[in-house]
């Protein structure tokens, strides 16, 4: 029997009866918050073999082992995870061992076993036999191994029953409890599972099977389950569902889950029955069960109940994330903020259509409107008094509307209004009239030529670069000396530069009036000699990196109320020279015969140019005499060389730390002080623990139903 869509057992241990007939839990299993210690011995669920999502145990008093509850749990698929984990055992006060002796596979996700004060038999389980990667496992704050004295079956009688594997250079017996070994399949099975009698299962089986080489005898399926058989792919007219089984179209059409109730039903896409079309696809019609690719970003219509959405902070902008069509009016009123331009672009950058009007007022933090980088149509279905559908008033630092060379914006109905934007040149407004098709709609007072652009250098001359020289981490550039009508109006130059992998940057990218700017700025004074061209050496740059550079002349902006000319260059793209690459990463070598070594590595993190080849050098070294000191035919444990790793696990240190041998002298001395890196790592670790605990509490503490 398949049970689903996730089972939450809390408060009352008798709710466990809900698991009675389950063979597969399609979803998660939570067992938590049972504060009264109970006797769980009468509860046993031998039918349960698979959990498709994750298993979470939290604060269950009196439960000492999971082995009696779930003796045949074989696979946790991890199709959906709990904070990256497929198995979470947290604050289980009485748990003494995990005991899931039939658990053979956790298909996806890691494990988190934390704050279980009495929990032992953790170091005796080889998780690498169950999980693909053990590096993300988090096993912390449990009973210290020294206090556990874990013994695998038969060890005391000197008739060990369990097999050995190596973990962290420790070659040891592997078991779940004092009487349950960890099952390992013969090497002849390779990646395949095996029966209790060590016969290899069918390749489509996962975890275990009741008969060898039979795809109908699997305990769980490696790929998909359909009509009693494990199959590599779902047969025609059936679709993958929840990552483990095949269902028909009717089943998919009829799913009504709590998670999907607001949607238009499940869809069939790419052979899978899923809750929504994946990223980049949209339903082929509102009630369709099929998906088609979106042209450009997928449309998402957002509507404001009160008709007008006020954007006065990043928080209010956040509500528009992903929206492509905004039904209503936008009122933008950003007076201050941190990194505001890029934040607004992140949340409003996909908006293509506004059905009503757009009003920007008192937005002193804005330098440009380029954060609305996809806006192409203002319908003007609703207009401000005076029939305005684009209204820009009193924005003290607004300098650019959009980059009109790369922007096509149409205002379908309504007029534009601009007033009291002292840094916005009227030429920029006139250009907008042309592009948006509003030329001729505005009356004389709608674009105020006196108080727009009054504090800007509006009629710009072009500065021309005269030379560029590059090295691996420097760029030297010079440009023509700019000569305004009155030389006293020229104060200095400002050079702007930044990394630009692509030639698509604009002057106002990431810039706002509150100090955030994606450009680096350097001031360049005028050369005292009038015949010397101004220039600069930009240093500390990265090798083989393309930079965008432009220069602006800093001029006095007003001369007796007349606009004066300013000057700036075009954006120049220039690449630094190549340099020596950083070292190749993760070098591994292994011998696959008596005369061969296989060496593998990853590319360097900083190639600093186009890598064309690697040089591999090797040399013969004398044999280590250490290898001859041990009789490898003896039954004793093979000695392991331990290398100090320079870190101390705080939780494990119980004796006086003043026992280390330091500086080559015999005798006690103090533990070395922690390095900054170690302190930082500890801080991050503590932070990570807090984040997980918060996530756990937020996920599981819910209001009591009814």
């Amino acid at each position: 029997e398949i049970c689903g869509p996730g089972i939450d057992i809390r408060n009352d241990y008798q709710q466990l009866k809900r698991l009675e007939n389950c063979t597969v839990i399609e979803g998660y299993l939570h067992i938590l918050l049972i504060s009264k210690a109970e006797d769980y011995r009468s509860y046993r669920f031998p039918k349960l073999t698979v959990i498709t999502e994750y298993l979470l145990l939290f604060r269950v008093a009196g439960l000492e082992s999971l082995g009696d509850l779930f003796p045949n749990l074989t696979v946790i698929r991890g199709w959906k995870l709990f904070y990256n984990y497929a198995l979470v055992i947290f604050e289980m006060t009485n748990l003494k061992d995990i005991g899931l002796y039939n658990l053979r596979n956790i298909t996806r996700g890691a494990i988190r076993i934390e704050k279980n004060a009495d929990l032992c038999y953790l170091s005796t389980v080889d998780w690498s036999l169950i999980l693909d990667a053990v590096s993300n496992n988090y096993i912390v704050g449990n009973k210290p191994p020294k206090e556990c004295g874990d013994l695998c079956p038969g060890t005391m009688e000197e008739k060990p029953m369990c097999e050995k594997t190596t973990i962290n250079n420790e070659y040891n017996y592997r078991c779940w409890t004092t009487n349950r070994c960890q099952k390992m399949c013969p090497s002849t099975c390779g990646k395949r599972a095996c029966t209790e009698n060590n016969e290899c299962c069918h390749p489509e089986c996962l975890g275990s099977c009741s008969a060898p080489d039979n795809d109908t005898a699997c305990v769980a399926c490696r790929h998909y389950y359909y009509a009693g058989v494990c199959v590599p792919a779902c047969p025609p007219n059936t679709y993958r569902f929840e990552g483990w089984r095949c269902v028909d179209r009717d089943f998919c059409a009829n799913i009504l889950s709590a998670e999907s109730s607001d949607s238009e039903g499940f869809v069939i896409h790419d052979g899978e029955c899923m809750q929504e079309c994946p990223s980049g696809f949209i339903r082929n019609g509102s009630q369709s069960m099929y998906c088609i690719p979106c042209e450009g970003p997928c449309p998402k219509v957002c509507e404001e109940e009160k008709k007008t959405k006020t954007i006065d902070s990043v928080t209010s902008a956040q509500m528009l994330q992903g929206c492509t069509i905004f039904k209503g009016n936008l009122l933008i009123n950003i007076r201050r903020g941190n990194n505001i331009a890029s934040e607004l672009e992140n949340f409003m950058g996909l908006i293509e259509v506004v059905t009503g009007y757009v009003k920007i007022r008192h937005s002193h933090a804005l330098v440009s409107l380029s954060f609305l980088k996809n806006l192409r149509l203002i319908l003007g279905e609703e207009q401000l008094e005076g029939n305005y559908s684009f209204y820009v008033l009193d924005n003290q630092n607004l300098q650019q509307l959009w980059d009109w060379d790369h922007r096509n914006l149409t205002i379908k109905a309504g007029k534009m209004y601009f007033a009291f934007n002292p840094k916005l040149c009227v030429s920029e407004i006139y250009r907008m009239e042309e592009v948006t098709g509003t030329k001729g709609r505005q009356s004389k007072g709608d674009i105020n030529t006196r108080n727009n652009g009054e504090r800007a250098s509006c009629e710009s001359d072009v500065l021309h670069f005269t030379s560029t020289t590059t090295s691996k981490n420097r760029i030297i550039i010079t440009w023509h000396r700019y000569r305004p009508p009155d030389y006293r109006d020229l104060i200095s130059f400002t050079v702007y530069y930044k990394e630009a992998p692509f030639k698509n940057v604009t002057e106002y990218d990431g810039q706002d009036a509150c100090g955030s700017n994606s450009w680096n700025m350097v001031d360049v004074d005028l050369p005292p000699n009038k015949d010397v061209e101004p220039g600069i050496l930009l240093h500390g740059l990265k090798p083989w990196t393309q930079y965008a550079v432009y220069v602006k002349a800093v001029t006095l902006t007003m001369v007796e109320n007349d606009h004066i000319r300013g000057a700036k260059s075009e954006i120049l793209y220039i690449r630094t020279n190549a340099s020596v690459p950083s070292i190749p990463l993760d070098v591994l070598s292994a011998s696959n015969s008596s005369s061969q070594l296989i060496v593998k590595w990853n590319p360097p993190s900083l190639p600093n140019g186009n890598l064309s080849y690697y040089i591999v050098r090797w040399q013969r070294q004398p044999q280590d005499g250490y290898l001859y000191r041990h009789n490898y035919c003896s039954k004793d444990k093979i000695p392991i060389r331990k290398y100090a790793d320079g870190t101390i696990d705080i939780e494990e240190v119980t004796e006086n730390p003043k026992t280390e041998v330091c500086g080559g002298e015999k005798g006690p001395c103090c533990a070395c002080p922690k390095t900054e890196a170690e302190k930082q790592a500890e801080k991050e670790e503590a932070e990570y623990r807090k984040v997980f605990e918060n996530f756990l509490h937020n996920s599981i503490f819910v209001p009591r139903p009814e």
Partner: antibody, heavy 117, light 112 residues
Framework: QVQLQESGPGLVKPSETLSLTCTVS?????????WNWIRQPPGKGLEWIGY???????NYKPSLKDRVTISRDTSKNQFSLKLSSVTAADTAVYYC??????????WGQGTLVTVSS | DIVMTQSPLSLPVTPGEPASISCRSS???????????LQWYLQKPGQSPQLLIY???NRLYGVPDRFSGSGSGTDFTLKISRVEAEDVGVYYC?????????FGQGTKVEIK
């Protein structure tokens, strides 16, 4: 496989309250779907009584609304029907059934309730 | 309430011959989302009803292709191209587009 099983007294006296329980196995009633009661008087057609939604809301047939209550016990994964002030006209086979987005996909086997003194 | 009226109420058939049942609703059963939630169920003697057709014309996976559904708005039809002995029972149409949901009164199909 989802299974629904009706249970309750087979005989109810007139003017009393008919109480039935539907025990669901294989699917959590809070996880999704609409959990329905349908009845069929002997030799007659099917009549929808109402449903209890996974989110706790109910919908009833207007002509029965004043007499009917559908509730749930999430800890036992059960939902129940209470029909008050019964008469002989309420004698029927009572079915519980699960409805998804489009159709009834699972039905109980039905339980006969006779209203008689 | 929307009234679903089936005809005929009784349909004697010869195995191998076609059969047709009509279902008419007292008002349109097109849902606001554009779908028409009309289903056909078969109740065999002593059993619970079982689904044959959903959303007017979608045959449930595993239902023989001799069963087909059609119609729109207020008029709907279930056709059996060649009746077989196992098809006997009472056929109900059902609308789930508007609450209260309603069944037709049923059509009894029996072998002549």
């Amino acid at each position: 496989q989802v299974q629904l099983q009706e249970s309750g007294p087979g005989l109810v006296k007139p003017s009393e309250t008919l109480s039935l329980t539907c025990t669901v196995s294989g699917y959590s009633i809070t996880g999704g779907y609409l959990w329905n009661w349908i009845r069929q008087p002997p030799g007659k057609g099917l009549e929808w009584i109402g449903y209890h939604s996974y989110d706790g809301t109910n919908n009833y047939k207007p002509s029965l609304k004043d007499r009917v209550t559908i509730s749930r016990d999430t800890s036992k994964n059960q939902f129940s029907l209470k029909l008050s002030s019964v008469t002989a006209a309420d004698t029927a086979v009572y079915y519980c059934a699960r409805y998804g987005r489009v159709f009834f996909d699972y039905w109980g086997q039905g339980t006969l309730v006779t209203v008689s003194s | 309430d929307i009234v679903m009226t089936q005809s005929p109420l009784s349909l004697p058939v010869t195995p191998g011959e076609p059969a047709s049942i009509s279902c008419r609703s007292s008002q349109s059963i097109v849902h606001s989302n554009g779908n028409t939630y009309l289903q056909w169920y078969l109740q065999k003697p002593g059993q619970s009803p079982q689904l044959l057709i959903y959303k007017v014309s979608n045959r449930l996976y595993g239902v023989p292709d001799r069963f087909s559904g059609s119609g729109s708005g207020t008029d709907f039809t279930l056709k059996i191209s060649r009746v077989e002995a196992e098809d006997v029972g009472v056929y109900y149409c059902f609308q789930g587009s508007h609450v209260p949901w309603t069944f037709g009164q049923g059509t009894k199909v029996e072998i002549k």
